[in-house]
Amino acid sequence: NFMYSKTVKRLSKLREYQQYHPSLTCVMEGKDIEDWSCCPTPWTSFQSSCYFISTGMQSWTKSQKNCSVMGADLVVINTREEQDFIIQNLKRNSSYFLGLSDPGGRRHWQWVDQTPYNENVTFWHSGEPNNLDERCAIINFRSSEEWGWNDIHCHVPQKSICKMKKIYI
């Protein structure tokens, strides 16, 4: 029976993934009962990705390692719509690391997942980035401009946002 074997495979995958993320929240995508997309609980989902707001305060490097151990990366923001989704889950009095850095301090910004940096899809606060020694990017709230990006020193502990592709089972 096709449906039975599909269910057995799905349960097997769930068991395999459970040691890394003990609880998954899954939805059926489209009309096909075969396609389930999942995010770890309590991650949030938007389009084809899952997001986790890490409230522990860590340096940029440690924040990225924390994400990667979970099978994710610090968030790479590709569109205004994605940023608008993300900020719904952020606190205005906090700052959060993005997966964006300038390791050489030469204003060669690069995303942690090698996505090409596109100047046309950036959301820097006005006047930012403004310091060659500030080589990591955060997203934070300024009352005059709402949410935007700022460059800061990478060693200064911040909260962070992890992102990974949805898990398909």
Partner: nanobody, 127 residues
Framework: QVQLQESGGGLVQAGDSLRLSCAAS????????MGWFRQAPGKEREFVAA????????NYRDSVKGRFTISRDNDLNAGYLQMNSLKPEDTAVYYC????????????????????WGQGTQVTVSS
């Protein structure tokens, strides 16, 4: 906790071949994307090759395409880097790295995307 151990490095002549191995322990190897990176003296560590969980997807840096082949054996908890037509500029310490992933087809290329690293094995290519 994942542990990695590279082997197979050595001193060879330009044009020769070497096969590097990476033995993994501590977790289910098939849940991890594997990458090889290298660091030459005085230079930054750079991506060499990566292979997806299933082995079906690979990525290579341009300078090694056609000469190096990455592979893995999930039953043996091991990964490999076959290096042919070696050049003096391939001289470096070679590191294997692992990254948990839930996609069977993704081969990550970013150094910071890999949290688990081996100690490295030295490859020296003389002219």
């Amino acid at each position: 906790q994942v542990q990695l151990q590279e082997s197979g490095g050595g001193l060879v002549q330009a044009g020769d071949s070497l096969r590097l191995s990476c033995a993994a322990s501590g977790d289910t190897f098939s849940m991890y994307t594997m990458g090889w990176f290298r660091q030459a003296p005085g230079k930054e560590r750079e991506f060499v090759a990566a292979i997806s969980r299933s082995g079906g997807s690979t990525n290579y840096r341009d300078s090694v395409k056609g000469r190096f082949t990455i592979s893995r054996d999930n039953d043996l908890n091991a990964g490999y880097l076959q290096m042919n037509s070696l050049k003096p500029e391939d001289t470096a310490v070679y590191y294997c790295a692992l990254r948990l992933t839930f996609s069977t087809t993704t081969a990550y290329t970013g150094e910071l995307q890999y949290p688990y690293w081996g100690q490295g094995t030295q490859v020296t290519v003389s002219s």
